[in-house]
């Protein structure tokens, strides 16, 4: 089952700055990501940002910058202008929509240990990444091995002994995994294209996961919308979702110009517009 993980970080340098990281673990194409605070989307939560994999991002105050980090994860920087720091005990929710298969949502908040109200500001704890742990572990084994061999050779010079029986050390026993929520996410750590067939904004693609992410994914609230995609059903390619055939809605008598592969926009298209809608359905 697909999962959504949410992690909220407070910047150690600026206590008024927060970053929300969200990710989608599972197969499928992401058609839209919405980030809200104060509750889940559609349940009283207030929108902070909406991210489309091809058409860009929209954000509302106090959101400062929303961006795609990888094909399946996003980050949202927030600027807390109030002195009381309302973000400290606020719930942030991320909803990953895959139209028409379904949407998955999960929420998270700032860990209590990083409460800005504490006497001392929280210091970020560096988390050893799996690859670094492996390298360090292997280096340690090699150094130890060399030292041990030198020690034996020196002893052999002073006192002749029978043939040496080398001791075997399992270097694998010294490697460590820093973050292993699931097999799917492990594959995604090393090969972001391995398990997730999604689209992204090439300009902002950053396939490397930042150091210091240690929160495990929370189980997503799956809201099935539309026919459930069976294992044998191929997931829709993003190109077919926003296609030239769409026309992306043109006004009467207008022919849309081509604006890129698989995308057609209006002649008067001015990019994302932050419009407060009248479509608040109650």
């Amino acid at each position: 089952t697909p999962e959504v993980w949410v992690q909220v970080q407070m910047e150690a340098t600026e206590l008024s700055s927060f970053t929300v990281h969200c990710g989608f673990l599972g197969p499928g194409s992401i058609s839209l990501v919405t980030v809200s605070w104060g509750g889940p989307d559609g349940a009283g939560g207030t929108k902070l940002a909406v991210l489309h994999p091809e058409l860009g991002t929209r954000q509302w105050a106090p959101a400062r910058q929303a961006r795609w980090e990888t094909q399946s994860s996003i980050s949202l920087a927030l600027e807390d202008s109030g002195a009381s720091s309302p973000f400290a005990n606020t719930t942030f929710c991320c909803k990953f929509a895959s139209f028409p298969e379904g949407s998955w949502e999960s929420c998270g908040s700032l860990p209590p240990s990083s409460d800005p109200g504490l006497s001392a500001p929280p210091t970020p704890v560096p988390i050893l990444r799996a690859d670094l742990a492996g390298i360090l572990g292997l280096s340690g084994v090699l150094l130890f091995g060399c030292g041990y061999l030198l020690h034996l050779l020196r002893r052999q010079k002073h006192r002749p002994t029978p043939r040496l029986q080398p001791s075997h050390t399992n270097s694998q026993a010294l490697t460590a995994q820093a973050w292993a929520p699931s097999q799917a996410s492990q594959a995604a750590l090393h090969d972001p294209y391995a398990t997730i067939n999604t689209s992204f904004c090439p300009a902002t693609l950053d396939t490397a996961h930042p150091n210091g992410w240690a929160s495990l994914p929370t189980h997503a609230a799956h809201q099935p919308q539309g026919p459930a995609a069976s294992a044998s059903t191929p997931i829709l390619a993003r190109g077919s979702f926003v296609s030239v055939e769409n026309g992306l809605y043109t006004q009467a008598g207008e022919r849309p110009p081509h604006t890129g592969p698989g995308l057609t926009l209006f002649p008067d298209c001015r990019g994302p517009r932050a419009v407060e809608g009248r479509f608040g359905v109650r």
Epitope: L32, G44, H52, R58, V242, L265, V281, R282
Partner: nanobody
């Protein structure tokens, strides 16, 4: 949670008419478009029509002059009047509530879909 329930689909002969309805309930904050998408058998998704928050309807080229999208705010309902139906209009029609990106309505919530079959 937003609930969108479509109705009005069915079998119709070429040249015939159908009226799709979508009843919306729940709560959506800051959504700014409501519309219809469709998916023909074995084909990709296609935006059919949507209404902006400013009330302006927009249509995909292939349905202009044949389809009309309308809204009843009092009933929290969306409609799609489909006239002069063609075989190529056969698809599952989804009612969506979403966000505008330029002049594109990106679905954030949608219904289960209603099947429209145009055949003689």
């Amino acid at each position: 949670e937003v609930q969108l329930v479509e109705s009005g689909g069915g079998l119709v002969q070429p040249g015939g008419s159908l009226r799709l309805s979508c009843a919306a309930s729940g709560y959506t904050s800051r959504t700014d478009c409501m519309g219809w998408f469709r998916q023909a058998p074995g084909k990709g998704l296609e935006g059919v029509a949507h209404i902006d928050s400013d009330g302006i309807p927009r249509y995909v080229e292939s349905v202009k002059g044949r389809f009309t999208i309308s809204q009843d705010h009092a009933k929290n309902s969306l409609y799609l009047q489909m006239n002069s139906l063609r075989a190529e209009d056969t698809a599952v029609y989804y009612c969506v509530v979403g966000f505008k990106f330029g002049d594109y309505c990106a679905p954030n919530d949608w219904g289960q879909g209603t099947m429209v079959t145009v055949s003689s």
